[in-house]
């Protein structure tokens, strides 16, 4: 079994490993998340994403997590087990993104644009919160992201 985000195939990443890493940090993250009214990965971001769209969307979402979320969060955590779990998530996200080759062909413009609009909904929600709250919430919602990604883990 492998991840198949439409035409983009990802090898060497097992959802179970991602989940184990998330579960190790989940209680810490979700306990610190005081804003229950807002959601970053809202339904409109991840619902009814076509296979073709999925490659663009997972690429932009994971890059955002790597460049913005993990990069800014590791120095706020002191517990060794939590730190290692962040690294496991980050390294697996790097492995996934490194293998993705979203098509830049002109005929894919509408699909690319649709995926980008979904990403902008997520980023807008992220920017509406203060930095600390946004980082905490984004990490707390990794389970939503993993649940969505797992739909693309196929034979």
């Amino acid at each position: 079994q492998e991840f198949h985000f439409g035409p983009c195939q990802v090898k060497g990443v097992v959802p179970q490993k991602l989940w184990e890493a998330f579960w190790a940090v989940k209680d810490t993250m979700q306990a610190q998340d005081n804003i229950t009214s807002a959601r970053l990965l809202q339904q409109e971001v991840l619902q009814n994403v076509s296979d073709a769209e999925s490659c663009y969307l997972v690429h932009t979402l994971l890059e955002f997590y790597l460049k913005t979320v993990f990069k800014n969060y590791h120095n706020r955590t002191v517990e060794v087990r939590t730190l290692k779990s962040f690294s496991t998530l980050a390294n697996n996200f790097v492995l996934i993104v490194s293998q993705l080759q979203p098509s830049q062909e002109n005929e894919m413009f509408s699909i690319r644009d649709s995926a980008h609009r979904r990403f902008l909904l997520f980023r807008r929600a992220f920017k509406q919160l203060d930095v600390e709250a946004a980082l905490t919430k984004a990490l707390g919602e990794v389970d939503i992201l993993l649940t969505w990604m797992q739909k693309f883990y196929k034979l």
């Epitope: 990069k71 962040f86 496991t88 390294n91 790097v94 490194s98 293998q99």
Partner: antibody, heavy 118, light 109 residues
Framework: QLQVVESGGGLVQPGGSLRLSCVAS????????MSWVRQAPGKGLEWIAG???????YYPDSLEGRFTISRDNAKNTLSLQMNSLKSEDTAVYYC????????????WGQGTQVTISS | SSALTQPSAVSVSLGQTARIACQGD??????ANWYQQKPGQAPALVIY???SRTSGIPERFSGSRSGGTATLSISGAQAEDEADYYC????????????FGGGTHLTVL
Amino acid sequence: QLQVVESGGGLVQPGGSLRLSCVASGFTFGDYAMSWVRQAPGKGLEWIAGITWNGNTYYPDSLEGRFTISRDNAKNTLSLQMNSLKSEDTAVYYCAKGGIGATVFGSWGQGTQVTISS
Amino acid sequence: SSALTQPSAVSVSLGQTARIACQGDSIGNYGANWYQQKPGQAPALVIYDDDSRTSGIPERFSGSRSGGTATLSISGAQAEDEADYYCHSADSSNYFLSVFGGGTHLTVL
């Protein structure tokens, strides 16, 4: 038995080109990222190129586009094309399984010597 | 200059504990791996993901991490542990790229 074997090293004049090859066996080559790592005489290890199973390539900025990594999954072969060679490229060149970002170099070849001298 | 900093040399008395530190911004995000290299040989993976020991590696080898510093420890160092040790992580400015520390030569006295 997992194995990677490099070949193609030798003596080249500055400004010249060389193509290194690496043949892998004992694992499903087409499922893994591969890398080239070099070691200049008396110096440390330097990662110089990485490639995912599907051909996405990564290089350190320091190489200035002189080296190109490629692979042929059907032939279990990894290659490194080196152009505009300089004396500072003199080193033992290792082929290694893995190595995108912080992911491990799980298996190494014995290396092939490249000498750049006039 | 390397993005990962480790001492160029460490000495330890036979049977004592040797510690080699490796410091770098990216270690906080991505962790570290450690390789052992003996003269005339290819490097070999000793510790991966901060603290996981490669199969076949003696239990005296262990790894840990605190923030942006990873540490390789060898408790009860043996003569055969004399070698060069390299830490490895992702590049701090581009997580797709790999980077090694400058290497530490361990001498067992």
